[in-house]
């Protein structure tokens, strides 16, 4: 008759929570029998992030510090199941928690916008197309943002049209700009729950062109045409 | 990036034996168990069993029991299928694939064919 | 062991259409359930796992829903690239099966 390693109840062992959940809460469970009916110790191994700790008797899993998503899930920890007494033989397992996304990443624009620039003067009103993203993970549709100008004053020389969940155009209302640069600032709300707002700032530049580019005298860059 | 690069197809008689390879790179060979999946022509997927590199340990399909042996080198970050005593409905393509929650990464699948 | 029914077996759809894919475990499997798309002569792709998580770089056109035996895979809007085979799978406990695939094929 040889002794036999504990057997757990399941392959693996999930389970999901919120990425917000208190430190302290019960986030899963794993159970393992014994063969001869020895008593089971519980134990983690793995544990990179200092995330989990495991309660020895019960095998269940509690938080121990804040969770975030964005470090990666699911998460994932062996669990390790050991005989009380007679051979101390264990088995492993996987535990795997899965963290469900919180709206905890503000928007923000997409790639770097400096080198903006229409030519001066304009010869008619003109647009820019931008793109905003954040960190946050949109289960089953993308990112649906919406644009709005940072402040009031900006809305005589400019408007935002929203052309997608991800894009928005800048436009001039007009023609009359001096030859210097403007920072536009653009509000991006996320529309999550709870809505995150960022207030992101946009360059552009009023500059003479020499064969579409921004004329600089020497030492300074050639900007791209943008619009 | 993780990648799983399995060996050459294989032709064999009846009663033989074969040994597929996988050579796992681009992650941490011994933190994930690795299995073994086969596809025969015009089938679904069959799960043979799985290795876990860090222990050693293996369980297998009780269809597979007596035939099959599992094993892995992390010298070279490679495990190893052999399937014994061949007959001509395991003439499949055998997988390896990584396990998490479900199979994330999978080998490009290695066609054994059991022929007289 | 655990047997996983999936239907349709076969299935005929436009670019544009939504569809859907079922699959019923012969007992509770707690959405220990992942969902595959394989196409010939590669590799199964892994979409979803725990019944309903996206898995990363999967476009948000694929979700998963349901619990306990009963479970579905849809795709919101079929894109060209689509058209393949669709597995499930159960990981509760081994030996892990998978359901018989449910070929979708171009109308």
């Known amino acids: 008759d040889v002794n036999e390693a504990p057997q757990f109840s399941q392959h693996v062992f999930q389970a999901k929570v919120s990425e917000d959940v208190a430190i302290g809460t019960k986030v899963g469970n794993v159970t393992a029998k014994d063969p001869e009916g020895l008593d089971i110790s519980y134990s983690l191994r793995g544990d990179t992030r200092g995330w989990l700790k495991i309660d020895h008797v019960t095998g269940e899993i509690f938080s121990v510090a804040p969770l975030d998503r964005e470090a990666g899930s699911p998460y994932r920890v062996q669990v390790v199941a050991t005989e009380v007494g007679g051979s101390s033989l264990s088995s492993v397992s996987e535990f795997h928690l899965i963290l469900m996304d919180v709206n905890d990443n503000p928007p923000r624009l997409a790639k770097d916008y400096t080198g903006l620039f229409f030519c001066h003067p304009l010869s008619a009103p003109g647009s820019l197309i931008f793109e905003a993203t954040d960190d946050d993970q949109h289960l089953f549709r993308g990112p649906h943002f919406t644009f709005s100008l940072g402040s009031g004053s900006l809305q005589n020389d400019w408007e935002v049209s929203k052309i997608n969940g991800t894009h928005a155009r800048l436009s001039t209302r007009h023609t009359e700009f001096e030859e210097r640069e403007y920072v536009v600032l653009i509000r991006i709300n996320d529309g999550g729950r709870p809505p995150l707002e960022g207030i992101v700032s946009l360059p552009v530049t009023f500059c003479s062109c020499v064969e579409g580019s921004c004329f600089r005298p020497a030492g300074h860059k050639h900007h791209h045409h943008h619009h | 990036q993780v990648q799983l690069v399995q060996s050459g197809a294989e032709v064999k008689k009846p009663g033989a034996s074969v040994k597929v390879s996988c050579k796992a790179s681009g992650y941490s060979f011994s933190s994930y168990w690795m299995h073994w999946m086969r596809q025969a022509p015009g089938q679904g997927q069959e799960w043979m069993g799985y290795?876990?590199?860090?222990?050693?340990?293996?369980e297998y399909n009780q269809k597979f029991k007596d035939r099959v042996t599992m094993t892995r080198d992390t010298s070279t970050s490679t495990v190893y299928m052999e399937l014994s005593s061949l007959r001509s409905e395991d003439t499949a393509v055998y997988y390896c694939?990584?396990?998490?929650?479900?199979?994330?990464?999978w080998g490009q699948g290695t066609l054994v064919t059991v022929s007289s | 062991d655990i047997q996983m029914t999936q239907s349709p077996s076969s299935l005929s759809a436009s670019v544009g259409d939504r569809v859907t894919i079922t699959c019923r475990a012969s007992e509770n499997i707690d959405s220990y359930l992942a969902w595959y798309q394989h196409k010939p002569g590669k590799a199964p792709k892994l979409l979803l796992y725990?019944?309903?998580v996206l898995e990363s770089g999967v476009p948000s056109r694929f979700s998963g829903s349901g619990s306990g035996t009963d479970y579905t895979l849809t795709i919101s809007s079929l894109q060209p690239e689509d058209f393949a085979r669709y597995y499930c799978q159960h990981y509760y406990r081994t030996p892990l099966t998978f359901g018989q695939g449910t070929k979708l094929e171009i109308k």
């Open positions: 725990a019944a309903t």
């Open positions: 290795i876990n590199p860090s222990t050693d340990y293996t």
């Open positions: 694939a990584r396990s998490r929650l479900g199979f994330d990464y």
